[in-house]
């Protein structure tokens, strides 16, 4: 299930997706003065099973005399099958890098993409929230944003940050550096069955960062 | 697939300069930060600096504050890194590495860690001796 919205923007905060989770589709944008290529992919997609996750396709730009004046799709999931699978992994990363079970990594850059990235979030989508430089964070729990189902409507929930000014006091005393837990999110949500799969990231990650990735149109 | 290409790397005594420059050409620099990450023999790979290619902001290791210099040319699609002042300590294979910027194409110092960059150059080595 796609996600209806982006994720929540939060006043002097950026965020991204750390990881995307398998069904997340991501346009094969490119700058102004390309367009893909004839027989290119509109998309690429994340796939795979328990053990491994790619994306599948690949985005290629050329050189453009006119204008690419192609739609920004949400492609439907019949036109998911029988696409090429192509591993979008650098030669060069290195052997520590994190991954989560049923996610795929950003995809590595393709030359001469759009500088925005339109990514088709699924439910169960996270991504991280950080303030930006000269911005402190007050935490009152995650600064994290997960699409739910709720309702058999879907939203993102509401990370739990304040981000403020150097010189600005404190509001939640001894509350600026606290380890974001994934559980027990605070939602003033009325009771009813919320269909997620909120999966926990690793501790490593998230105690580094409470940071994001992107998110359907995040720059 | 785009490719980062370092150059600029050699030999230098103590207390002199070295230039760095990473090349790569077709990445749409405004998308991206883009940067410097080290590794010396038996060490982790550590970042030394980045600059955010939407906004020229630049972040430096403390190790390397007023001693070096990063800078961006987008039109050339390059990144320099300006060594001076070199210490024995600097000596390591210097990786070119690129990260997708966050929302609102800003970028934190917190992500620029060694397993979460997008693309890495083969990297170029820097000898400094005493």
């Known amino acids: 299930e796609l996600c209806d919205d982006d994720p929540p923007e939060i006043p002097h905060a950026t965020f991204k997706a750390m990881a995307y989770k398998e069904g997340t589709m991501l346009n094969c944008e490119c700058k102004r003065g390309f367009r893909r290529i004839k027989s290119g992919s509109l998309y690429m997609l994340c796939t795979g099973n328990s053990s491994h996750s790619s994306w599948d396709n690949q985005c290629q730009c050329t050189s453009s005399a006119t204008r690419n004046t192609t739609k920004q799709v949400t492609p439907q999931p019949e036109e998911q099958k029988e696409r090429k699978t192509t591993e979008m992994q650098s030669p060069m990363q290195p052997v520590d890098q994190a991954s989560l079970p049923g996610h795929c990594r950003e995809p590595p850059p393709w030359e001469n993409e759009a500088t925005e990235r339109i990514y088709h979030f699924v439910v169960g989508q996270m991504v991280y929230y950080q303030c930006v430089q000269g911005y402190r964070a007050l935490h009152r729990g995650p600064a994290e944003s997960v699409c739910k189902m709720t309702h058999g409507k879907t939203r993102w929930t509401q990370p739990q940050l304040i981000c403020t000014g150097e010189m600005e006091t404190s509001q939640f005393p001894g509350e600026e550096k606290p380890q974001a837990s994934p559980e027990g999110r605070p939602e003033s949500e009325t009771s009813c069955l919320v269909t997620t799969t909120d999966f926990q990231i690793q501790t490593e990650m998230a105690a580094t960062m409470e940071t994001s990735i992107f998110t359907t149109e995040y720059q | 697939q785009l490719q980062l290409v370092e150059s600029g790397g050699g030999l230098v005594q103590a207390g002199g300069s070295l230039r760095l420059s990473c090349a790569a050409s077709?990445?749409?620099?405004?998308?991206?930060?883009i940067g410097w990450f080290r590794q010396a023999s038996g060490k982790e790979r550590e970042g030394v600096s980045y600059?955010?290619?939407?906004?020229?902001?630049?972040f430096y290791a403390d190790s390397v504050k007023g001693r070096f210099i990063i800078s961006s040319d987008n039109a050339k699609n390059t990144v320099d890194l300006q060594m001076n002042s070199l210490k024995p300590d600097d000596a390591a294979v210097y990786y070119c590495?690129?990260?997708?910027?966050?929302?609102?194409?800003?970028?934190?110092?917190?992500?620029?860690?060694?397993?979460?960059?997008?693309?890495w150059g083969k990297g170029t080595l820097v000898t400094v001796s005493s």
């Open positions: 590495a690129v990260d997708r910027l966050g929302s609102r194409g800003a970028y934190v110092s917190t992500w620029w860690r060694s397993p979460d960059m997008d693309l």
């Open positions: 077709g990445l749409t620099f405004d998308g991206y930060a």
């Open positions: 600059i955010n290619g939407r906004d020229g902001s630049t």
